[in-house]
Interface confidence: medium
């Protein structure tokens, strides 16, 4: 079992190194910013031009492109729940410095947890996404 575990670790490590998780990070950041914007926006203020697409629509289109790319990358981890967890942890760690305040961090984490399902993939049943808990072993 140990030999298999070692090979599994190496395979996961090389998958993680090959994967480009940046689209996932961009998709999630845009998603939580879009949510914040829609909550923060005054519903009674008239739009500048009723015929031009709002910046939210434009950003939404970009985000769906990021999501598609992101899902393609995550698809590589579909058959390895442990490695899928590693990928999600990596996304969390990469973005943790850019998240402002506890609320944004919780929101990002919530969206990150839902990401595999959004991609039609199996989410790892258990996965520690706390970044405060110190550095992670990278095998």
């Amino acid at each position: 079992r140990q030999q298999w575990e070692l090979q599994g670790d190496r395979r996961c490590q090389s998958q993680l190194e090959r994967a480009n998780l940046r689209p996932c990070e961009q998709h999630l950041m845009q998603k939580i910013q879009r949510d914040e914007d829609s909550y923060g926006r005054d519903p009674y203020s008239p739009s500048q031009d009723p015929y031009s697409p709002s910046p939210y629509d434009r950003r939404g289109a970009g985000s769906s492109q990021h999501q598609e790319r992101c899902c393609n990358e995550l698809n590589e981890f579909e058959n390895n729940q442990r490695c899928m967890c590693e990928a999600l942890q990596q996304i969390m760690e990469n973005q943790s410095d850019r998240l402002q305040g506890r609320q944004q961090e919780q929101q990002f984490k919530r969206e990150l947890r839902n990401l595999p399902q959004q991609c039609g993939l199996r989410a790892p049943q258990r996965c520690d996404l706390e970044v405060e808990s110190g550095g992670r072993d990278r095998y």
Epitope: E5, R126, C127, L129, E130, E132
Partner: antibody, heavy 123, light 111 residues
Framework: QVQLVQSGGGLVQPGGSLRLSCAAS????????MTWVRQAPGKGLEWVSN????????DYLDSVRGRFTISRDNSKNTLYLQMNSLRAEDTAVYYC????????????????WGQGTLVTVSS | QSVLTQPPSVSAAPGQKVTISCSGT????????VSWYQQLPGTAPKLLIY???KRPSGIPDRFSGSKSGTSATLGITGLQTGDEADYYC???????????FGTGTKLTVLG
Amino acid sequence: QVQLVQSGGGLVQPGGSLRLSCAASGFKFSTFYMTWVRQAPGKGLEWVSNIKQDGSEKDYLDSVRGRFTISRDNSKNTLYLQMNSLRAEDTAVYYCAANGLQDSYSGDFFDHWGQGTLVTVSS
Amino acid sequence: QSVLTQPPSVSAAPGQKVTISCSGTGSNIGHNYVSWYQQLPGTAPKLLIYDNTKRPSGIPDRFSGSKSGTSATLGITGLQTGDEADYYCATWDADLSAVLFGTGTKLTVLG
């Protein structure tokens, strides 16, 4: 307040069967992951089995898989452990525990425990 | 069944601080949340810490948890004689699809 009351323990011969019950009250049973944990005399804690809120997913300790079956009846607020082909090494105090795992990413922690019931397998 | 490794025993005088370590691997502590339990003689275990660092209501802040990489630590400050008990860590192991408990640590409060 939360209560888990266990029953069904006792003395059984090797190869025999026993069914443990754990009656829950004071919380919404159908929303909690449930678990069985055992402790052999003078030894540490050993997890035995988990069952999801709706009973759809079950996990077992390797050494009991195929012999033990965890189940729940949410209408009766009761958790069960059917133990077949019992061995001397299954002798232990068995605890049922309610697991506060509300979403699937949280940890496996057991925040409410039954009083424990002794199962002795001996000829 | 593989285990999470804890020191068999620790001891300190009342009022002092102790830490109990729990060492695992990438498939358990490295990926999953850790919880800690206290078991007084002849009683059922009691949850002290969950999700690495959180305390259930009613658990004093003398008890704290932390996690780094594949190890977790329980800290107890201001030791009291009532803290004499066995302490266990626990987490999920992704490879075994099982919950693992630590080997257990007996805490003795001296004097």
